[in-house]
């Protein structure tokens, strides 16, 4: 048997091109240089090469920088980033949009793999804060990416980039994001005009405080049923019957059909019912007429 | 002279898992693609994956998932992980060596073991 | 997806016969296919390499040709230690595909 290490006479590489799709896998790494590899990367993908033959491709470089690629690399490596391991990725310095643009186009379709997450949280620490330019492309192409973040992270992000954000992308987040994410929201919209502000600020407001919602009932803004059911029940429930009259608006009549859901139920529960009932649908479970109601959390506050 | 051996087959019930071994001498497994491939009762030959010199795994497509291909070269073991069996998967399992010392499969495999029988029956 | 047909399914000859089994890819594999020999209750033997090498200690009537997409094993004198199945085998992509063998050919004694 031939011992199958050495480049047979003829087969040296002189550059990436159709040819070498016709190599056998222990040619393909006998015979191509890594360094000429690491060169014409942009080439690789223009290259029908097998699954198997990628692998021996990954594997010269990885020789060559085992302490990870250069960008100059990393960039062109197309869809040779589906084989990256979350450990080859985390050895890399990527600081280029561009390159993270160009790695995110691979997976696009797709859904965020351990590769990208590892991409994304590498280009992000190199940043150091998510900006605006990074959360448009991140949003662009992963909606949900933001809910993904801890709100440790969120707090990184600079209120100017909450321009880049589409309802679409808060729809996964929890509460303890959409606090984090409102007064960022809150001051960045705040220089907008009362409807303006409301069609931008609807988005985050399962993060808004009592004393918002208290303020947005004050301005007619008619917030659909939707929107209420997400907001926070610690902020919804010392609404008077009024002010949530007066949020709602047109849209009051859709409490009825959540008079068993959070928060309106709680809400329910904490409202005497003459001021259930002066809305006209029929709300039941609140507090009976003479009954006192004592708040022992003020009384708490106040010992 | 080089050698393999399998071991680990046997009676299983359906859902179960097993493990196969292959112990393979007279070649380094950091040299040589290892193979697996099985063969039901008087049926064809049916690939189910190897795994190159480096440690890179391939598969046939209905076996990814349910079947996984390790190695520890410092054992010169070679190992076929399969999990939610099924009758199906009743057959001779063979391991075998990738034929080239380029250590990826290039040319076919040779040598073969013996094979060790896996059946799946309640 | 890359599969492999086997043609004839089985076939009868005598001692001294020239035989043929034939291979197609359903796409081009260039050079890359492999042949082996099985006999019952033993594993396969690696006859062929590269579509037309002969594996070592292989004997000299066995030949293959072929490439691209359409393959042949010839046994140019049937011998009675012939009388096995034979089986293709594609390596030109081994990765997510449904097998890499042919279906095998039969040979029996007419």
């Known amino acids: 048997e031939v011992e199958k290490t050495a480049c047979p006479s003829g087969k040296k590489a002189r550059e990436i091109d159709e040819s070498l799709i016709f190599y056998k896998k222990w040619e393909l790494e006998a015979c191509v240089d890594a360094a000429l590899l690491a060169t014409q990367m942009d080439r690789v993908n223009a290259i029908p090469f097998t699954y198997e033959q990628l692998d021996v491709l990954k594997h010269k470089l990885d020789e060559l920088y085992p302490q990870g690629y250069p960008e100059s690399v990393i960039q062109h490596l197309g869809y040779l980033f589906l084989k990256m391991s979350p450990e080859d990725i985390r050895k890399w310095n990527v600081t280029s949009l561009e390159t993270l643009k160009a790695l995110l186009e691979v997976n696009k379709g797709h859904e965020m793999s351990p590769q990208v997450a590892t991409l994304i949280d590498r280009f992000v620490k190199g940043r150091g804060q998510l900006d605006k330019d990074t959360l448009d492309t991140l949003t662009a192409f992963y909606p949900g990416y933001l809910c993904s973040l801890s709100p440790e992270e969120l707090s990184s992000v600079p209120p100017s980039s909450i321009w880049a954000v589409r309802p679409q992308d808060l729809d996964t987040c929890d509460p303890r994001q959409l606090d984090v994410l409102y007064p960022k929201a809150r001051l960045a919209f705040q220089n907008m005009n009362g409807s303006e502000y409301f069609v931008k600020i609807q988005s985050f407001l399962g993060g808004a405080p009592t004393e918002d919602l208290k303020a947005l009932s004050q301005q007619n803004v008619s917030m659909d049923l939707a929107t209420f059911m997400k907001l926070r029940t610690d902020a919804v429930l010392p609404l008077t019957v009024a002010e949530v009259q007066k949020l709602l608006g047109p849209h009051v009549e859709g409490l009825k059909a959540e008079e068993r859901h959070r928060p309106v139920r709680d809400w329910i529960l904490r409202q005497r019912q003459d001021d259930l009932d002066t809305l006209g649908l029929g709300l039941q479970g609140g507090i009976p007429n003479g009954y006192l109601v004592l708040d022992l959390s003020m009384q708490e506050a106040l010992s | 002279q080089s050698q393999l051996v399998e071991s680990g087959g046997g009676r299983v019930q359906p859902g179960g898992s097993l493990r196969l071994s292959c112990a393979v001498s007279?070649?380094?497994?950091?040299?040589?693609?290892m193979g697996w491939v099985r063969q039901a009762p008087g049926k064809g030959l049916e690939y189910i994956g190897y795994?190159?010199?480096?440690?890179?795994?391939y598969y046939a497509s209905w076996a990814k998932g349910r079947f996984t291909i390790s190695k520890d070269n410092s054992k010169n073991t070679v190992y076929l992980q399969m999990n939610s069996l099924r009758a199906e998967d009743t057959a001779t399992y063979f391991c075998a060596r990738g034929s080239s010392s380029g250590g990826y499969l290039d040319d076919g495999f040779d040598p073969w073991g013996q094979g060790t029988q896996v059946t799946v029956s309640s | 997806a890359l599969q492999m047909t086997q043609s004839p399914s089985s076939l009868s000859a005598r001692v001294g016969d020239r035989v043929t089994i034939k291979c197609q890819a359903s796409?081009?594999?260039?050079?890359?296919l492999a042949w082996y020999q099985q006999k019952p209750g033993k594993p396969p033997k690696f006859l062929i390499y590269?579509?037309?090498d002969l594996a070592s200690g292989v004997p000299s009537r066995f030949s293959g040709s072929g490439s691209g997409r359409d393959f042949t094993l010839t046994i140019s004198s049937l011998q009675p230690e012939d009388f096995a199945t034979y089986y293709c085998q594609q390596v030109y992509d081994s990765n997510n595909v449904e097998n890499v063998f042919g279906t095998g050919t039969k040979v029996t004694v007419l």
């Open positions: 007279g070649f380094s497994l950091s040299s040589y693609a």
């Open positions: 590269d579509a037309s």
């Open positions: 796409q081009s594999i260039s050079n890359y």
């Open positions: 795994i190159s010199k480096i440690g890179t795994t």
